[in-house]
Interface confidence: medium
């Protein structure tokens, strides 16, 4: 799973899945997470706390899936058969960044790095598992 | 009214690096609600996005060229740039920097605003 | 990418005849977020720089004569202008802006017979 900032190895083997408790991520598709996630949270208070940043973003509604998105790498999904946590896809990221960045620029902030598209998946394959777009948000 | 204005070197040897400015005028590149492209015409060709940048410095690159090229931004100078490293005779063309307009209350967006473009020939 | 094909490349028209030109996209340009099509159309007159026409499929540009009109739906797409003028030569562009790269189709040509 080639993700940069987002750390694979992060979880690995040891942490066992948990219940998604962060209010955003409720309802989303799946109910389980790992931790730390992809940005490197140990917990998921600390995940929502650095999370709620986007609240104004998701309740915009520039991007149907930006809640999805935020959530897979803030309280990715986990499974009991991977021992890694599974992160979005990249035309996901790419789609919510290209709707969503020019409503953050108006406010003066830019898209953060830490969300760099570019390390996540092309594509969901055995060898980089990543989460498509659900088909409804 | 909004005026840009490119400047640069008309003629860059292969395998060097083509830079050019785009200076703004008649509006503050701060602004919000807009992004700042470059988009390049080789000789008799259609219309090619480079890339965009915003005012806060965050870029969006063409995947084909975006290992060879850097768009920055400089506010206190109301301009932006452009850098293509180890250019080849297939970057001739005609390079213009524009204003990318996006609504965020519809979501229109456009290329409202180009410069006049500036020929960009690589030869030795 | 997505990829943006005209049809035809040229066209040469009478003045104060119609005209119609097609594009056709790879992939749909519908955002089914906000509904809105990303499609614009940009006409490049000879020696003169890209200029908008008519963006989000339909909407005519400030200044843009009315005898210009976008539509379409999905992936095909058409410009019309109800009445061509001497001043309507140049090379005719359609672009998408769903999804990054932007893509510009490769433009028809109209002339004035």
């Known amino acids: 799973l080639e993700i940069g900032r987002f750390d694979p190895e992060r979880g690995r083997g040891a942490a066992p899945c948990q219940a998604v408790e962060i209010p955003m991520c409720r309802g989303i598709g799946y109910n389980l997470t790992r931790m730390p996630n992809l940005l490197g949270h140990t917990s998921q208070g600390e995940a929502a706390a650095e999370l709620a940043e986007f609240a104004p973003l998701v309740q915009y509604g520039c991007h149907s899936h930006l809640r999805f998105f935020l959530c897979s790498l803030y309280a990715p999904m986990c499974t009991d058969q991977v021992s890694t946590p599974i992160p979005a896809c990249r035309p996901m990221c790419e789609q919510a960044r290209l709707r969503c960045a020019p409503i953050m620029e108006q406010f003066n902030f830019g898209w953060p790095d830490s969300l760099d598209c570019a390390r996540l998946p092309t594509r969901n394959d055995p060898h980089a598992l990543c989460m498509e777009a659900p088909e409804n948000a | 009214q909004l005026q840009l204005q490119e400047s640069g070197s008309g003629l860059v040897k292969p395998s060097q690096t083509l830079s050019l400015t785009c200076a703004v005028s008649g509006g503050s590149i701060s602004s919000g609600g807009y992004s700042w492209s470059w988009i390049r015409q080789p000789p008799g060709k259609g219309l090619e996005w480079i890339g965009s940048?915003?005012?806060?410095?965050?870029?969006y690159y063409n995947p084909s060229l975006k290992s060879r090229l850097t768009i920055s931004v400089d506010t206190s100078k109301n301009q932006f740039s452009l850098k293509l490293s180890s250019v080849t005779a297939a970057d001739t063309a005609v390079y213009y920097c524009a204003r990318f307009y996006y609504d965020i209350l519809t979501g229109y967006s456009y290329f409202d605003y180009w410069g006049q473009g500036t020929l960009v020939t690589v030869s030795s | 990418d997505i990829v943006m094909t005209h049809t035809p490349l040229s066209l040469s028209v009478t003045p104060g005849e119609p005209a119609s030109i097609s594009c056709r996209s790879s992939r749909s340009l519908l955002d089914t977020d906000d509904g809105n099509t990303y499609l614009d159309w940009y006409l490049q007159k000879p020696g003169q720089s890209p200029q908008l026409l008519i963006h989000t499929l339909s909407h005519r540009a400030s200044g843009v004569p009315d005898r210009f009109s976008g539509s379409g739906s999905g992936t095909d797409f058409t410009l019309k202008i109800s009445r061509v003028e001497a001043e309507d030569v140049g090379v005719y562009y359609c672009m998408q802006s769903i999804q990054l790269p932007w893509t510009f189709g490769q433009g028809t040509k109209v002339e004035i017979k």
């Open positions: 940048i915003y005012h806060s410095g965050s870029t």
